[in-house]
């Protein structure tokens, strides 16, 4: 058992069936020795009496607020929180697995540049009393400072049968230093508490590998006099690192034709110009990529040729 | 470039930028493979880092490329003399297109094009011998590689940098 | 729109057994544990019984252990409870509940969905 915060405790629990689970000591927070009395959550019924109350967790019936009283008036309470360990690995009830990049990826993180500012993202079905708190640092062993925002319910999406949710907040390294080489990694930590459960994910990485460039912006066409070419042309977006002769992009264009099936030529320009043939009801499409490390590729921008 | 004489930029530009493409096909991201473990943090201390204070941002460039330099070159020899180790040279072999030996040479190129014949910088210590398991040293070159990635990227961009604004 | 719908109640002698079923619809109740909770005239609503997720885990109040049995159908969206050697005690309106995230609690309080509920009554 360990303390999460001020009379909140998380009970770890080997999970399965009649497992012994752990025994607890529960100690009333007062100098009153004589008359106390125990309960747990709103029900009336006295669990026991005396300054302590010895108690065998073993499943969530014997979580939640425990309360000690004497003459009708509450002295003190302990919230105890199961968290869950099977087979040896600590469960993963709350949030979906997102299986990208690979198995067990619970948490997603993003960046549009390199100022140590990135998004972290998860999903859940569950609707009700669900509450998240996030810590961040780089490095574990000597950790230095991340401060993130408060988690926000970013979306909401029908999935078959269910409604799932998606929770998202925003972290920003407090001493970022965009030119150099990181050496150590960010590590994000996310405890979730649903109702009496607690559950904690963790992820780590580098920013270089989480950079996801805004599409670009201001995409043009030219047509071109006397011909079936048109110049296109489009600029690095506002949210991307600079100056841009030092954090450089380098874009793949691409022009679609009506049809899916069509077969559509890519080509790869450090440039921010090029010359293609745009035929009627195709579309020009750019993306843009980190010009020396090979992080993701934004979303596409595109316009259409006519 | 020692001395304080400017380096070639435009030339380092190119061979930067392609020590990245040679460096991202010898090691593209195979599926996401998280190459971190548990005292990791400890482990990449034996390599140069280019690090906040080495002058490598836009603004230190300005100021006094030479640190900054200097810094790359020691990273180019650490990395040229790992790849020519027996981590990359032991069991098991190479694929005979594999592209480190390029990768290598352009190490070598780009060290010599920061530091010509006659003058020595100080160079880091070369690494602790290599691990004894094929599979160990297997997993060492992809973490090399992973690192040598980083590295040549900010390599790349100090090198962009100067050639579009400190150029002659 | 959630619904749970409870059936199976009805009026029977000590001794007897009855078989209440619950029907879910509306959302898949596969990631929810269900419960089984009654209320006799008078008095707090009470858990009766409960089974996790996966069915694999179950828990019953002292008064029932041994007697009652939950069991569920993840394909179908249906939990039963099926009540052996009932005893007028017994007796009481039976609800049918669910709570999101897997695991029982017994706990009125904490389940997210609920029926309508079905009168059980035990005569002497």
């Known amino acids: 058992i360990w303390e999460l915060k001020k009379d909140v405790y998380v009970v770890e629990l080997d999970w399965y069936p009649d497992a012994p689970g752990e025994m607890v000591v529960l100690t009333c927070d007062t100098p009153e020795e004589d008359g106390i009395t125990w309960t747990l959550d709103q029900s009336g019924e006295v669990l026991g009496s005396g300054k302590t109350l010895t108690i065998q967790v073993k499943e969530f019936g014997d979580a939640g607020q425990y309360t000690c009283h004497k003459g009708g008036e509450a002295l003190s309470h302990s919230l105890l929180l199961l968290h869950k360990k099977e087979d040896g690995i600590w469960s993963t009830d709350v949030l979906k697995d997102q299986k990208e990049p690979k198995n067990k990826t619970f948490l997603r993180c993003e960046a549009k540049n390199y100022s140590g500012r990135f998004t972290c993202w998860w999903l859940t079905t569950i609707s009700t009393d669900l509450t998240f708190s996030v810590k961040s640092s780089r490095g574990s062993s000597n950790p230095q400072g991340v401060t993130c925002g408060a988690v926000t319910l970013s979306a909401e999406r029908v999935r078959g049968d269910n409604k799932e949710y998606e929770y998202s907040v925003e972290c920003q390294e407090d001493s970022a230093c965009p030119a150099a080489e990181e050496r150590l990694p960010i590590e994000v930590m996310v405890d979730a508490i649903h109702k009496l459960k607690y559950e904690n994910y963790t992820s780590s990485f580098f920013i270089r590998d989480i950079i996801k460039p805004d599409p670009p912006k201001n995409l043009q066409l030219k047509p071109l006099k006397n011909s079936r070419q048109v110049e296109v042309s489009w600029e690095y977006p506002d949210t991307w690192s600079t100056p841009h002769s030092y954090f450089s992009l380098t874009f793949c264009i691409q022009v679609q034709g009506k049809s899916k099936r069509e077969k559509k030529d890519r080509i790869f320009t450090d440039k921010t110009s090029a010359t293609v043939i745009c035929r009627k009801n195709a579309s020009f499409s750019v993306q843009a990529q980190d010009r020396y490390y090979s992080s993701s590729w934004s979303e596409w921008a595109s316009v259409p040729c006519s | 470039v020692p001395g304080g004489s400017s380096p070639a930029w435009a030339q380092c530009q190119q061979l930067s930028q392609k020590l990245c493409t040679l460096a991202w096909s010898a090691h593209p991201l195979v599926g996401h493979m998280d190459l971190r473990e548990e005292g990791d943090e400890e482990t990449t201390n034996d390599v140069p880092h280019i690090q906040c204070g080495d002058g490598c941002d836009p603004q230190g460039l300005r100021d006094n490329s030479q640190f900054c330099l200097q810094r790359i070159r020691q990273g180019l020899i650490f990395y040229e003399k790992l790849l020519g180790s027996d981590i990359f040279t032991g069991e098991p072999s190479l694929l005979p297109d594999s592209p480190v030996g390029q990768l290598h040479a352009s190490l070598l190129g780009l060290s010599q094009l920061l530091q010509p014949e006659g003058h020595h910088w100080e160079t880091q210590q070369i690494p602790s011998p290599s691990p004894s398991q094929p599979w160990q040293r297997l997993l060492l070159r992809f973490k090399i590689l992973r690192s040598l990635q980083a590295f040549v990227a900010v390599a790349a961009r100090v090198f962009a940098h100067g050639a579009a604004t400190l150029s002659p | 729109e959630v619904q749970l719908v409870e059936s199976g109640g009805g009026l029977v002698q000590a001794g007897d057994s009855l078989r209440l079923s619950c029907a879910a619809s509306?959302?898949?109740?596969?990631?929810?544990?269900m419960g089984w909770f009654r209320q006799a005239p008078g008095k707090e609503r009470s858990f009766v019984a409960a089974?996790?997720?996966?069915?694999?885990?179950?828990g019953y109040a002292g008064s029932v252990k041994g007697r009652f049995t939950i069991s569920r159908d993840g394909v179908e969206n249906m939990v039963f409870l099926q009540m052996n050697s009932l005893v007028p005690e017994d007796t009481g309106v039976y609800y049918c509940?669910?709570?999101?995230?897997?695991?029982?609690?017994?706990?009125?309080?904490?389940?997210?969905?609920w029926g309508q509920g079905t009168q059980v009554t035990v005569s002497s």
């Open positions: 509306g959302r898949s109740f596969s990631n929810d544990a």
């Open positions: 089974i996790n997720w996966s069915g694999e885990l179950t």
């Open positions: 509940a669910a709570v999101e995230g897997r695991d029982y609690y017994r706990g009125a309080q904490y389940y997210d969905y």
